[in-house]
Amino acid sequence: YDFTNCDFEKIKAAYLSTISKDLITYMSGTKSTEFNNTVSCSNRPHCLTEIQSLTFNPTAGCASLAKEMFAMKTKAALAIWCPGYSETQINATQAMKKRRKRKVTTNKCLEQVSQLQGLWRRFNRPLLKQQ
């Protein structure tokens, strides 16, 4: 999906008012310095591409993030503020239903959510120069 035509300010508002705290709660008990940010993004569409990938695509050691509250809210926000997003996701969901995993919090998942927090922070500050 091409995130170029999303309403970025509305997505930012959704993140600040309904998503960010759930990421913090997921990470509770973890030191903020525990994980290094290795995933970065250069602009808002790129950030959303990376956020979508890390949130919804199962990875080795962390297969269950897509079932977390913050993931559901992300899915809902993208569907509302990214034209055509919901249509492109319907087929993807049918495939995902076949490999539904139970929610498990592993160290790898914590690392992945830490990366997500960094991506969202970058998304919210698009005018900052890339480090």
Partner: antibody, heavy 117, light 108 residues
């Protein structure tokens, strides 16, 4: 303007079935997570069920296995099929637009379901 | 699912400040929403994301949330604020929406 209009409520005997409909207008229905919330007479609000644009569904434990939520995005309509109805299901049923999956920003006017013999 | 606890009733004199509490285990780690419902009407969202007001909601409505308690505050309460108020959050395991039992606000 944004509007949700419920229909299909009425009197039904215990063990019976009823299908509620909700016609949505004024917004891109197919993009939103939609839900049903009920309110028994003189009681508080109880979330019943919700459904994503892609058909992913969620249910309250009190209705799981008896109620089925569905939607027809081409008709901008939300449904609630209620089977094996009990007296405790008597309530006003509200159709609701659930913003960002976690709160309700638009409510319908409600339709009354009475389960009684 | 988590349980949200509200006082059944709160009374306030016109022009005074009304505070309605909503208690729940580690509630501060989740977002809380508040709805106003007048007799015979559907609920109306008055606070979202703990403390934000939707457009059209008067400035006298405010919200906070920390620890195990969220609070809806109505400053300079008016007669038209008399209604039932419901807090709402969600369960992080089931992902279900959860409502408090509701508080009847009476303006004396």
């Amino acid at each position: 303007q944004v509007q949700l209009v419920e229909s299909g409520g009425g009197l039904v005997q215990p063990g019976g079935s009823l299908r509620l409909s909700c016609a949505a207008s004024g917004f891109t229905f197919s993009s939103y997570y939609m839900s049903w919330v009920r309110q028994a007479p003189g009681k508080g609000l109880e979330w019943v069920s919700g459904i994503f644009f892609d058909g992913t569904t969620y249910y309250a434990d009190s209705v799981k296995g008896r109620f089925t939520i569905s939607r027809d995005n081409s008709k901008n309509t939300l449904y609630l099929q209620m089977n094996s109805l009990r007296a405790e299901d008597t309530a006003v049923y509200y159709c609701a637009r659930q913003q960002y999956f976690d709160h309700i920003d638009i409510w319908g006017q409600g339709t009354l379901v009475t389960v009684s013999s | 699912d988590i349980e949200l606890t509200q006082p059944p009733s709160v009374s306030v004199a016109p022009g005074q400040t009304a505070r309605i509490s909503c208690g729940g285990d580690s509630l501060g780690g989740k977002y809380v929403y508040w709805y106003q419902q007048k007799p015979g009407q559907a609920p109306v969202l008055v606070i979202y994301g703990d403390s934000k007001r939707p457009s059209g909601i008067p400035e006298r409505f405010s919200g906070s949330n920390s620890g195990n308690t969220a609070t809806l505050t109505i400053s300079g309460t008016q007669a038209e604020d008399e209604a039932d108020y419901y807090c709402q959050s969600y369960d992080l395991k089931s992902l279900n929406v959860v409502f408090g039992g509701g508080t009847k606000l009476t303006v004396l």
